[in-house]
């Protein structure tokens, strides 16, 4: 009863002589486990015996024993769901129907599976996509309705015998639904693959060839074109004729339209495979190609460069770069449309031919001002000589030349004068726009290259100017040579080195720092009295009377300058000592008498000593000796001694007379 048995397996299995067959199979017996299984080859039901007749390939019994000759066929199933079978090796005569006779306790069933065994390995089958277009990736599939665990195989792809293995992916299926081996090749066909043979080759595990399938690729592609031109080099002269032919080397599908393009632009009314150009002009020079379209799209040929030859056109000169800076390099380029390119050039500078210059470019490595002017050229090729064009102007720029600083004043210049200087130059390009002066002083803003220095200083030695355009050119500095009266006149003691003592030899020097002109005269003066006209003033033996305020004068042709007054100090021991008495040398007793020790000394007396008529020193040391009240006994001769750092001096004796008062006389 078929309702009691449910089977799943491939309907037909394919193999070849010597290979194997693996039959994936599942079943369900609804009334219990399988008790008996027989595999028949081409079973036929015998109505008489109510049993199946046919070759028994495999038999399993209730006790589970399998005859030894049944090793080639293996039942890999179980008692309730798996009925997988393997035949290894499989033989040609195994072709036909396999009958799986299943028996459970109460039910029986014969399940039939078709087995197709060929004499030789059958070829795989290549499946192509419906359309293949150039450069678009497609997947080619190679399918073989065979797979068996005991017999490994491989599928290899070849394009005209060249392997394409890395882009292929192989998969196998051994399921109850399907048994196959499949290889998928990812492939980007080019137009050159059109019509070429692709092979899928079946190999055994050792790489031995078993069978193959081949297909011819139908690769859709735009027309592939070749362009031919007469003359073949595509070089003609004005007035010649040119023929271009467009040949389609490949097109799939067939082409539909043809057109011609020049420099990328379509030529009107040119829709045949031949392009005839009669009496060409130079304007027809350019890149030509043909374009042919099919359903895939347009295809273009390679470009043909048509060169129409003509004599050079009037030339123009391009200067790199103008204006040019003196000392820089300049390149002149002679530009003239010509075909073929000019082979010879003649160059002109200000209308005069430049000898030895025959190239397209003229290079001047170091430009000088005289290079300025108009440059023109003439180009020449095999077809003739062109005309000289208008030329180009070379402007050579340079800093101002021969810059000088000129003193406008009459010479000599004296300190305090107003000095006018001008900045002169020989030539300049571009024009001078400003001037600079060195040193920078707080002078009037210079304009138009003139500098006025008000009240010129004695020390304004040199002045330089620069004339400036884009650059500044400095003149050599000029010496103003400012003349002035002697400066910094001062008295300087040369000897002695220490202080001056009376009797010393003394020399004074009249110094000055500078004088212009250098020729000078000296004058020494003391208290308005002229003492000498030398630079030195000498005293063989100085006396205190020589002390005083001295000045020296230095004069030149510009003027005279006096030193500051210089005080000459002479040091000497106390002299001219005398004792003066107050109120007089006769004093009445009881009154006051003051004795003063007067002296002349430098430095002043620092210490006094008083002596009496007995040369007895008195205990008094100041300049004044005061006797109060004076007594008659005080009468007598007194003298004093003065001391300074230089020495001592003493006075002569001075007599003091003290007379009695009337009272004393009255008492007597």
């Amino acid at each position: 009863d078929s309702s009691k048995w449910v089977f799943e397996h491939p309907e037909t299995l394919y193999a070849w002589e010597g290979a194997c067959v693996w039959i994936p199979c599942t079943y369900r017996a609804l009334d219990g486990d399988l008790e008996s299984f027989i595999l028949f080859h081409n079973p036929e039901y015998n109505k008489n015996t109510s049993k199946f007749d046919g070759t028994r390939l495999y038999e399993s019994t209730k006790d589970g024993k399998v005859p030894s000759e049944q090793k080639r066929v293996q039942f890999l199933g179980d008692k309730n769901k798996n009925c997988t079978l393997s035949i290894h090796p499989v033989h040609l005569n195994d072709s036909g129907q396999l009958g799986l006779r299943m028996e459970s306790k109460t039910e029986k069933w014969m399940e039939r599976i078709h087995l197709n065994v060929s004499e030789r390995p059958f070829p795989p089958h290549i499946q192509l996509p419906p359309e293949i277009q150039e450069s678009q990736e497609v997947t080619l599939t190679c399918l073989l309705n065979f797979s068996c665990y005991g017999y490994p195989i491989q599928l290899q792809w070849l394009l005209e015998g060249v392997p394409m293995r890395q882009a292929a992916v192989t998969s196998t299926s051994l399921t109850i639904k399907s048994v196959f081996t499949r290889s998928e090749l990812k492939f980007s066909p080019q137009w050159s693959h059109h019509g070429k043979i692709v092979t899928c080759q079946l190999q055994d595990a050792d790489g031995k060839f078993l069978s193959n399938d081949t297909v011819q690729l139908n690769v859709k592609h735009t027309p592939k074109l070749e362009i031919k031109v007469t003359p073949s080099d595509a070089i003609v002269r004005e007035g010649d004729s040119v023929t271009m032919t467009c040949e389609v080397s490949s097109s799939n599908p067939e082409y539909t339209t043809v057109s011609w393009l020049k420099d990328g632009t379509s030529l009107k009314k040119q829709n045949t495979f031949t392009l005839n150009l009669r009496e060409v002009t130079k304007d027809q020079s350019g890149k030509y190609c043909c374009q042919v379209s099919n359903d895939v799209g347009p295809g273009r040929s390679e470009e043909v460069f048509l060169q129409v030859q003509y004599a050079p056109e009037p030339s123009t000169v391009q200067i790199l770069h103008s204006p040019a800076v003196e000392g820089s390099q300049v390149e002149f380029l002679c530009m003239s449309l010509a075909n073929p390119l000019p082979t010879n050039y003649t160059w002109y500078h200000n209308g005069k031919e430049m000898q030895g210059r025959t190239e397209e470019k003229v290079h001047i490595p170091k430009i000088l001002p005289w290079h300025a002017g108009t440059y023109s050229c003439v180009a020449e090729n095999i077809l003739g000589t062109g005309q000289r064009g208008p030329g180009a102007e070379l402007d050579v720029q340079y800093p101002p030349k021969k810059v000088t600083t000129v003193i406008q004043n009459p010479m000599p210049i004296r300190e305090g004068d107003t000095v006018t200087l001008s900045c002169n130059y020989n030539s300049s390009n571009p024009s001078v726009t400003r001037y600079e002066w060195k040193p920078h002083g707080a002078w009037e803003e210079p304009s138009l290259g003139v500098l006025k220095i008000q009240n010129v200083g004695w020390d304004n030695t040199t002045i330089a100017c620069a004339a400036c355009n884009s650059w500044c050119s400095w003149a050599s500095p000029v010496a103003l040579n400012v003349q002035y009266a002697p400066r910094d006149v001062r008295v300087r003691k040369i000897k002695p080195l220490s202080e001056i003592h009376s009797g010393n030899s003394v020399s004074l020097q009249c110094d000055f720092s500078s004088s212009h002109p250098k020729e000078v005269q000296f004058f020494w003066e003391k208290n308005g009295r002229l003492l000498g006209k030398e630079s030195q003033l000498n005293f063989d033996s100085i006396s205190p009377e020589d002390a005083g305020s001295y000045s020296c004068w230095v004069n030149n042709s510009i003027g005279q300058t006096a030193s500051k007054a210089w005080t000459l100090e002479v040091l000497y021991a106390p002299r001219r000592l005398r004792v003066s008495m107050s109120p007089g040398d006769q004093v009445m007793e009881g009154k006051s008498a003051t004795l003063t020790c007067e002296s002349d000394a430098n430095p002043p007396v620092s210490h006094y000593t008083w002596f009496d008529w007995n040369n007895q020193s008195l205990p008094y040391h100041s300049q004044k000796l005061r006797l109060e009240p004076v007594k008659v006994q005080h009468s007598g001769a007194y003298w004093c001694q003065g001391t300074n750092s230089v020495g001592k001096g003493r006075s002569p004796l001075s007599t003091l007379t003290v007379y009695y008062s009337p009272e004393t006389i009255g008492r007597r």
């Epitope: 450069s135 394009l159 005209e160 060249v162 392997p163 394409m164 293995r165 890395q166 693959h193």
Partner: antibody
Framework: EVQLVESGGDLVKPGESLKLSCEAS????????MSWVRQTPDRRLEWVAT????????YYSDSVKGRFTISRDNVKSTLHLQMNNLKSGDTAIYFC?????????WGQGTTLTVSS | QLVLTQSSSASFSLGASAKLTCTLS???????IEWYQQQPHKPPKFVME???????YTGDGIPDRFSGSSSGADRYLSISNIQPEDETIYIC?????????????FGGGTKVTVLG
């Protein structure tokens, strides 16, 4: 039995040309792609060129592209390698090899020396 | 760029197991490669093909001691119970076809020495 026999190796000067040949027997020549492989003096193998079974496709290594041309005569079962503008770096033993899925058969090789 | 990298030499004791490595450039790590062996003054001989999953098949006359495996971009040629006659150079190779350009690249070769 597959047999591949190379010939044409020689001593040449840089810039000169030479043509190598390879005679095949023992298999259907027109069914297989064929190649030239060279072995340089430092013993390195370098693939040079391959031609498809009926000659529609030719492939070259970058080092010889534009100088070498591979060709075949399926009637005479012969493979050729035309070498122009030879350089000292082309000095090698040149093997002719049958290309199945891999190089399954090789000739014994012919020696090219490029030296001034 | 398709590149194969091999170590230049390897030494093994007689009877030991040897494992040679051929490494593909990283962007080509899924490619199938071939191993060839070359005795001195002889052409190379196909040894085996190894796929990315390690499955392989060996050429005619190659002993069962030779096997192949794969890991990432590495393809291995293993020789068990190495013998004196296995002392030679082993070179790996790989082919590719990109658009309409076929290329074949060889590794630098590994010189195998059998000690003892």
């Amino acid at each position: 039995e597959v047999q591949l026999v190379e010939s044409g190796g020689d001593l040449v000067k840089p810039g000169e040309s030479l043509k190598l040949s390879c005679e095949a027997s023992g298999f259907t020549f027109s069914n297989y792609a064929m190649s030239w492989v060279r072995q340089t003096p430092d013993r390195r193998l370098e693939w040079v060129a391959t031609i498809s079974s009926i000659g529609s496709f030719t492939y070259y290594s970058d080092s010889v592209k534009g100088r070498f041309t591979i060709s075949r005569d399926n009637v005479k079962s012969t493979l050729h390698l035309q070498m122009n503008n030879l350089k000292s770096g082309d000095t090698a033993i040149y093997f002719c090899a049958r290309l199945g899925v891999y190089f399954d058969s090789w000739g014994q090789g012919t020696t090219l020396t490029v030296s001034s | 760029q398709l590149v194969l990298t091999q170590s230049s030499s390897a030494s093994f004791s007689l009877g030991a197991s040897a494992k040679l490595t051929c490494t593909l450039s990283s962007q080509h790590s899924t490619y199938t490669i071939e191993w060839y062996q070359q005795q001195p003054h002889k052409p190379p001989k196909f040894v085996m093909e190894i796929k990315k999953d390690g499955s392989h098949y060996t050429g005619d006359g190659i002993p069962d001691r030779f096997s192949g495996s794969s890991s990432g971009a590495d393809r291995y040629l293993s020789i068990s119970n190495i013998q004196p006659e296995d002392e030679t150079i082993y070179i790996c190779g790989v082919s590719d076809m990109i658009k309409d350009q076929f290329v074949y690249v060889f590794g630098g070769g590994t010189k195998v020495t059998v000690l003892g």
